[in-house]
């Protein structure tokens, strides 16, 4: 017998062809011999089956000797053997209906697990293979699990169900809720304005939740909350904000914060958390602030940086257009009795300048 695979919720068309290319009498029945539909002349007649309101045919094809059975909004329990009786012949078609669903929401937080569950008719033994948007293949039976979802797992998952050498393909859209970057670093000279941006890696029509930025200043023994806010339909409203520093937060996405000036006491690292409505867990983004200060005190020219710098970063002091006078993998460098001129303090990573501060040394008379 012919095997046809269908997808839950879809429409399937089972074919039945007569040798005569004309409209003749036909009937479709299920395995219990209950009539589903048939014809009386040019009229469609329906039997007492459970498919009554979901079964149909194409009258336009009857004249060509084609008498299809169309079943809409397929259910797993529609899996059955369907018999077409035409011209004293019986054509049997076995319909197997499968469903594949994410057994949680399809909007999942980064790091959470995705479980796909296959619904299948009794007696079937399908195999499933899914391909993630980043090309990763996973195989399984009735359930497939992916732990520790990453940002690259956002998108359309394509799953193929194989049964009796026949295939049916499912597409499931998964949205991984995360910030675009797990971590970012901002380099500023003392006194400069600071802007922190926290763009999300997903878009949804209505976004509601609440968030907080905790800050661990390098000079402080413990972290403190800098700001708490609510998010309602993508509108940001500040609930509480520290008075030092004088932070401002933008009211529209992407989440955006500004400090009027970078100061050594603010250098450090922060953690912005966002709890979304109806979701367990939180989104996180780390943000780091590195602050540079160049000063001249009597005969000592000093350059310092505060904040989370990697050990491979180089701090140097040089007179403009000259070789570096001092260059160290440290957070402070100095030159005694500096020559007059424009001095540059540079923080660099493998030759790439991350931060630069200029200071003018006047001649001493």
């Amino acid at each position: 017998k012919k095997v046809v695979l269908g997808k839950k919720g879809d429409t399937v068309e089972l074919t039945c062809t007569a040798s005569q290319k004309k409209s003749i009498q036909f009937h479709w029945k299920n395995s219990n011999q209950i009539k589903i539909l048939g014809n009386q002349g040019s009229f469609l007649t329906k039997g007492p089956s459970k498919l009554n309101d979901r079964a149909d045919s194409r009258r336009s094809l009857w004249d060509q000797g084609n008498f299809p059975l169309i079943i809409k909004n397929l259910k797993i329990e529609d899996s059955d053997t369907y018999i077409c009786e035409v011209e004293d012949q019986k054509e049997e078609v076995q319909l197997l209906v499968f469903g594949l669903t994410a057994n949680s929401d399809t909007h999942l937080l980064q790091g959470q697990s995705l479980t796909l569950t296959l619904e299948s008719p009794p007696g079937s033994s399908p195999s499933v293979q899914c391909r993630s948007p980043r090309g990763k293949n996973i195989q399984g039976g009735k359930t497939l699990s992916v732990s520790q979802l990453e940002l690259q797992d956002s998108g359309t998952w394509t799953c193929t169900v194989l049964q009796n050498q026949k295939k049916v393909e499912f597409k499931i859209d998964i949205v991984v809720l995360a910030f675009q970057k797990a971590s970012s670093i901002v380099y500023k000279k003392e006194g400069e304005q600071v802007e922190f941006s926290f763009p999300l890696a997903f878009t949804v029509e209505k976004l509601t939740g609440s968030g907080e930025l905790w800050w661990q200043a390098e000079r402080a023994s413990s972290s403190k909350s800098w700001i708490t806010f609510d998010l309602k339909n993508k509108e940001v409203s500040v609930k509480w904000v520290t008075q030092d520093p004088k932070l401002q937060m933008g009211k529209k996405l992407p989440l955006h914060l500004t400090l009027p000036q970078a100061l050594p006491q603010y250098a450090g690292s922060g953690n912005l958390t966002l709890a979304l409505e109806a979701k367990t867990g939180k989104l996180h983004q780390e943000v780091n602030l590195v602050v540079m200060r160049a000063t001249q005190l009597q005969k000592n020219l000093t350059c310092e940086v505060w904040g989370p710098t990697s050990p491979k970063l180089m701090l140097s002091l040089k007179l403009e257009n000259k070789e570096a006078k001092v260059s160290k993998r440290e957070k402070a460098v100095w030159v005694l009795n500096p020559e007059a001129g424009m001095w540059q303090c540079l923080l660099s990573d493998s030759g790439q300048v991350l931060l630069e501060s200029n200071i003018k040394v006047l001649p001493t008379w």
Epitope: E235, M249, K251, K252, H256, T258
Partner: antibody
Framework: EVELLESGGGLVQPGGSLRLSCAAS????????MSWVRQAPGKGLEWVSG????????YYADSVKGRFTITSDNSKNTLYLQMNSLRAEDTAVYYC????????????WGKGTTVTVSS | AIQMTQSPSSLSASVGDRVTITCRAS??????LGWYQQKPGKAPKVLIS???SLQSGVPSRFSGSRSGTDFTLTISSLQPEDFATYYC?????????FGQGTKLEIK
Amino acid sequence: EVELLESGGGLVQPGGSLRLSCAASGLTFSTFAMSWVRQAPGKGLEWVSGISGSGENTYYADSVKGRFTITSDNSKNTLYLQMNSLRAEDTAVYYCAKEGYNWNYMDVWGKGTTVTVSS
Amino acid sequence: AIQMTQSPSSLSASVGDRVTITCRASHGIRNDLGWYQQKPGKAPKVLISETSSLQSGVPSRFSGSRSGTDFTLTISSLQPEDFATYYCLQDYTYPYTFGQGTKLEIK
């Protein structure tokens, strides 16, 4: 076409109250944030108060905080500004303004209603 | 609250002149700044939103730009109908704040 029409202005004594209304036509009121902006005679524009489309969040300039209350009635497509403890410096033309879909700018303004606080 | 410092407060110019008006924000405000034109006895009208987006129906001689926290409105060639008062408005966060205004007069 979207139109905003303010009403409720007038002469009031210091310490008195007034309620301004802003009737909107041609828009789904609950979709947009709205603001009240005022202009004292011969002076510049001053933002007074704002309300989110849902009506859940309200905001005020420091100069009116605790005295003015902004509300909206989506069923009537009307924005209100309840002004209590009025002072001479509240004398101004009060405009209501609708913000763009993503709060990008105040794209539609009413013609204004005049409030005079004087004894 | 974020302060918006607008300059100059008044400006005399002739038809055909190129004119620039500046607003400086006390905080970073991204591109969340608009420019508004107001004529005597009339409600303000938006010219530019989000720093540089020209509103429909606004002549292309108007343009906006940003450098850090400094925002500029430029009128490339003044026309008689451009003589009015211009305001910047930060809508980065509440409370919104306007600049003090620039009155553009005929020389």
